[in-house]
């Protein structure tokens, strides 16, 4: 299911609009759009909204703290990718308006549908790195100490770009316009050329890659993480770990029905009814995989709220408040300072 | 490679059914459509009917009535079938695929010869 | 239905020689949204099955001739053979894709 049209959307054919002629085809269906479509469009309208301003307010306070705070670096790395993704909002709106007529070409057509993939393996690959991160703070304390700085922070997100990028290719190289119906109408979608194993690979890999094998992992770690934290009765704050958490967990959630329909879309039938019907619901799901491109600045207000006890400072103060938990990371390779200075408070302070 | 390979009847009595079935390779039918296209003797192209590859259909208004196209996606296979055939439907039929822009045929069937007489 | 007017239904040419032909419609095949004619130029040879010259009115499939050249907007189309050769002798076929399909009746180039 690789983002809008997985295979040719069924909405029949309607009227070219700009064209006020008697002779123009009538449509043969109706010209509104279905339940799912609408409610796709509402989603992403407040995607849209949400993601850019509050990824680009994160981007503003984590970029002058990127310097300093390994944390910020990560929750930066973050925003960017979810802002990205934020940007092609526009286009897949007006493309699911006009019916799935894509107006913006086949270049478009490989690029921006991709980016909901290439945000979905940036950001998988983003929380295994800042939960290794939470990971070895907490069992490797010496080792951070030494090591842990912001040079190799940037790398291993560099890594994870890298990795994102590669494991996004598949869907760029088999998305393609085409023309049916008529008036003609453009689809975008993808065309694996009558390769089943090759489709259902795709499917599997991006599964278990971009979802069951991080599910898997972050909860192992996890898991460790909080019985350490909690075997310790930390009484300093948890902040950076919640909201971590928070948005790993949000992860998994909103790309859960986008991974099932995807999955089961490529081992079934074309013609059979549930194909037919989760093709019917391929834009919902994509949407609601796309909340997790604004969800995270809403965690982190909320995370500040509650640290804060009630919004009483400013937004950009809240949010790096909650992003930039660190403080200065001294310049030097082999030793970096954290917020505190006794290993055992700084192994509470996850 | 993309093939389309036609099989069915000669010969067609009148008043009888024809059914021509189109067996594609090289693509899938979920993602081109499939037009019929057939040609009488000495005389021009005439376009019949379309299969998109969501499955649903056009046809040529003149012949709504009796003709339905559909598909078998597991077996690449579309199907032809037009009613009441008379003495004026010989021709030979053509199954093309829907190239990827301009609605264009850009490949085409070897072509059924199609005889109706009785 | 759209009615597609070929002409000339015949033309006698010699190799080598430039030929055009005409294809007119009865509306206009262009369409807004996408901003494309849609007409189609095909090449039928005797006892063969037809083959995509043109589409879009003036973009060539690949593999065809460049000396085969599709104009014309809205009504009015025209394809052009700049230099024909002996394998160029067959009946060509203009299409309308825009409302349903057409056909024209073809033209027949013959020696």
């Known amino acids: 299911m690789d983002s809008f049209n997985y295979t040719t959307p069924d909405y029949g054919h309607y009227d070219d609009k700009d064209t006020l002629d008697l002779n123009t085809p009538v449509d043969k269906t109706s010209n509104t759009l279905r339940v799912p479509d609408i409610l796709a469009l509402v989603i992403f309208a407040v995607v849209f909204l949400v993601g850019v301003l509050g990824n680009a307010l994160v981007v503003w306070v984590t970029a002058f703290e990127a310097k300093r705070t390994i944390n910020a670096i990560w929750f930066l790395n973050l925003a960017v990718a979810d802002f990205l993704s934020c940007l092609a909002l526009p286009i897949l709106f007006t493309s699911i308006v006009q019916h799935h007529h894509w107006p913006f070409g086949g270049a478009a057509c490989s690029i921006l549908p991709s980016l909901i993939l290439l945000n979905m393996y940036a950001s998988i690959l983003l929380l295994a790195t800042i939960s290794a991160d939470r990971f070895l703070l907490v069992f490797k304390p010496i080792w951070c100490q030494n090591f842990r700085g912001a040079g190799l922070a940037w790398i291993a997100c560099a890594v994870a770009w890298g990795l994102a990028l590669l494991l996004t290719i598949p869907s760029f190289l088999y998305r393609v316009v085409r023309e049916e119906y008529f008036p003609p109408k453009v689809l975008c979608g993808v065309d694996y050329s009558h390769d089943k194993r090759r489709e259902r690979a795709v499917a599997i890999v991006r599964l278990v890659l971009g979802f069951l094998w991080p599910l898997l992992t972050l909860t192992i770690c996890y898991t460790f993480i909080l019985l350490r934290t909690w075997s310790r009765r930390a009484t300093r704050s948890t902040k950076t770990l919640k909201v971590v958490v928070a948005v790993v967990a949000s992860f998994f959630i909103f790309w859960l029905p986008y991974q099932v329909t995807g999955i089961m879309m490529s081992f079934l039938e074309p013609s059979s009814p549930t194909f037919l019907l989760l093709k019917k619901l391929d834009s919902l799901c994509v949407s609601f995989a796309y909340i997790n491109c604004c969800i995270n600045p809403i965690i982190y207000v909320v995370a500040g709220q509650g640290f804060q006890g009630r919004l009483r400072k400013s937004l950009p103060s809240l949010l790096r408040n909650v992003l930039t938990e660190e403080s200065v990371v001294r310049e030097s390779k082999s030793f970096t300072r954290s917020t505190v200075d006794t290993m055992a408070q700084k192994t509470q302070a996850v | 490679q993309v093939q389309l390979k036609q099989s069915g009847p000669g010969q067609v009595a009148p008043s009888q059914s024809l059914s021509i079935t189109c067996t594609v390779s090289g693509f899938s039918l979920i993602n081109s459509a499939v037009h019929w296209v057939r040609q009488s003797p000495g005389k021009g192209l005439e376009w019949l009917g379309v299969?998109?590859?969501?499955?649903?259909?056009d046809y040529n208004t003149a012949f709504i009535s009796r003709l339905s196209i559909s598909r078998d996606n597991s077996k690449s296979q579309v199907f032809f079938k037009m009613r009441s055939l008379q003495v004026d439907d010989t021709a030979v039929y053509y199954c093309?695929?829907?190239?990827?822009?301009?609605?264009?045929?850009?490949?085409w069937g070897q072509g059924t010869s199609v005889t109706v007489s009785s | 239905d759209i009615v597609m007017t070929q002409s000339p239904s015949s033309l006698a040419v010699s190799v080598g020689e430039k030929v055009t032909m005409s294809c007119k419609s009865s509306?206009?095949?262009?369409?807004?949204?996408?901003?494309?004619?849609?007409l189609a130029w095909y090449q039928q040879k005797p006892g063969q099955s037809p083959k995509l010259l043109i589409y879009w009115a003036s973009t060539r499939e690949s593999g065809v001739p460049y000396r085969f050249t599709g104009s014309g907007s809205g009504t009015d189309f025209t394809l052009t053979i700049s230099s024909v050769q002996t394998e160029d002798l067959a009946v060509y076929y203009c299409?309308?894709?825009?409302?349903?399909?057409?056909f024209g009746a073809g033209t027949k180039l013959e020696l």
């Open positions: 509306q206009s095949l262009f369409s807004s949204r996408t901003r494309k004619n849609y």
């Open positions: 299969i998109w590859s969501d499955g649903s259909t």
């Open positions: 299409k309308q894709s825009y409302n349903l399909l057409t």
């Open positions: 093309a695929r829907n190239g990827r822009l301009g609605n264009a045929m850009d490949y």
